[in-house]
Interface confidence: low
């Protein structure tokens, strides 16, 4: 893994220990950003419409990417876009959306071992000469001594969640992405109510292990709206 | 070899404005998030702000909200903290340092002493 | 804010000793705290991340364990070099806190 370099471009798959959200796909544009209160796990959203203005990836929800909104638009106003699904054209990693990678300017599945080693390769390659093209596109990346070679684990510094060891995604804290663990039955989960109520998070948790969904939990369905709590549920 | 270097400490008047510098060199600056810690003559360490490696994202610390400023210019490979109001208890010595996992802060500058006092 | 109560606060030791420092976080932060050591007119060295991944060039002798609320710094056999001043720092909520500091001094 890279476990010296810190909010990377291209993380799909992402987000906390405290409260933030899991993107849902399908919006055009993102909301204003989550709040998290300091020192707390209550986490809000600003629920208008507006779309939130980003430099790269990192600053967008989990299932979006930084882009203008215009086709070849102006490159100086970039928006939190929707991530594109399976078979959609892109042009680096951070376009598809959890499960899927970029590949000949389309979007495909993750083969996972076959994604890992391919990271792997290119992080081998560019060890010591200063160069990377892990997202899709060339980008000038220092690769210090705390580069391992092994898969990242629990904290560890990554780029995506290929970088991280079986079990792990990638998911933002704070200002950087480190690896954390994927989300088991019955752990709560975030889950947008509105596609596109979500924005950038200071933590993000990780999404639901395989044959789960983020669902809402039975006992809650009379809840009131804002107190609604999802869980990772069986198909 | 990671070096990053602060600078722009020193006498201010109470309700008086500095600029921190901090010059970093070694590795790729836009890649790190980057901080500022604080430390006041014989006390302990206090974390100040932070900033996400495009300068998109910022924190801070309670104490220093709406007062400081912390911003970035990575064609510089420069962080900056922009201080204004100045108070009496924001004397210490200001260290730059970047992030690393678990947000932990790998290497640090040798800190800049800024002296609020009339 | 999250608290971070380290202790003791100072301590006496020789070299060669084993050291024990512990730091207290007032709600759960996972294995979210880093270890500084500091010595005067100097700036923080990290030494463990993680709760207990060790930093690339930091001795063996240190090591770091716990995971929740309680968490211990250890340092096997205290070196002359080691007599500093200890920080613990949690990363799990904003605003990051560090403990008040345990200073580690000659017998």
């Known amino acids: 893994t890279l476990n010296s370099v810190l909010n990377s471009n291209a993380i799909k798959n992402l987000p906390p220990p405290l409260g933030g959200a899991a993107g849902h796909p399908g919006s055009a544009v993102s909301a204003a950003p989550g709040i998290l209160y300091p020192g707390g796990n209550k986490y809000q959203t600003i629920d208008n419409y507006q779309p939130y203005p980003c430099a790269e990836d990192e600053e967008c929800g989990t299932d979006e990417y930084c882009a203008s909104p215009t086709r070849g638009g102006d490159a100086g106003v970039q928006i939190c876009l929707a991530c594109r699904k399976r078979r959609k054209r892109c042009m680096r990693h951070a376009m598809c959306c959890p499960g899927n990678y970029c590949k000949n300017g389309i979007c495909v599945s993750s083969d996972q071992n076959h994604f890992r080693g391919e990271i792997e390769e290119t992080i081998t390659e560019s060890f010591g000469n200063d160069h990377s093209t892990l997202d899709g596109y060339s980008r000038r990346t220092t690769l210090s001594s705390k580069m391992y070679h092994t898969k990242g684990q629990e904290g560890s510094v990554c780029l995506r969640s290929s970088d991280c060891a079986s079990g792990l995604c990638c998911a933002r804290h704070f200002w950087s992405k480190i690896c954390k663990p994927v989300l088991k039955e019955g752990q709560v989960c975030t889950k947008h109510r509105r596609k596109g109520s979500h924005g950038l998070e200071i933590f993000q948790r990780c999404y639901c292990g395989e044959g789960l969904s983020c669902r809402i939990q039975k006992d809650h369905h009379q809840a009131s709206n804002s107190s609604r709590l999802h869980t990772c549920q069986r198909h | 070899e990671v070096q990053l270097l602060e600078s722009g400490g020193g006498l201010v008047q109470p309700g008086g404005s500095l600029r921190l510098s901090c010059a970093a060199s070694?590795?790729?600056?836009?890649?790190?998030?980057m901080t500022w810690v604080r430390q006041a003559p014989g006390k302990g360490l206090e974390w100040v702000s932070a900033i996400s490696r495009s300068g998109g994202n910022t924190y801070y610390a309670d104490s220093v909200k709406g007062r400081f400023t912390i911003s970035r210019d990575n064609s510089k490979n420069t962080l900056y903290l922009q201080m204004n109001s100045l108070r009496a208890e924001d004397t210490a010595v200001y260290y730059c340092?970047?992030?690393?996992?678990?947000?932990?802060?790998?290497?640090w500058g040798q800190g800049t002493l800024v002296t609020v006092s009339s | 804010d999250i608290q971070m109560t380290q202790s003791p606060s100072s301590l006496s030791a020789s070299v060669g000793d084993r050291v024990t420092i512990t730091c207290r976080a007032s709600q759960n932060i996972k294995t979210y705290l880093n270890w500084y050591q500091q010595k005067p007119g100097k700036a923080p060295k990290l030494l463990i991340y993680?709760?207990?991944s060790l930093e690339s060039g930091v001795p063996s002798r240190f090591s770091g364990s716990g995971s929740g609320t309680d968490f211990t710094l250890t340092i096997s056999s205290l070196q002359p070099e080691d007599f500093a001043t200890y920080y613990c720092l949690q990363t799990y909520s904003v605003p990051l806190t560090f403990g008040g500091g345990t200073k580690v001094e000659i017998k």
């Open positions: 993680g709760a207990s």
């Open positions: 340092a970047r992030t690393y996992s678990y947000g932990s802060f790998d290497y």
């Open positions: 070694g590795f790729t600056f836009r890649s790190y998030g």
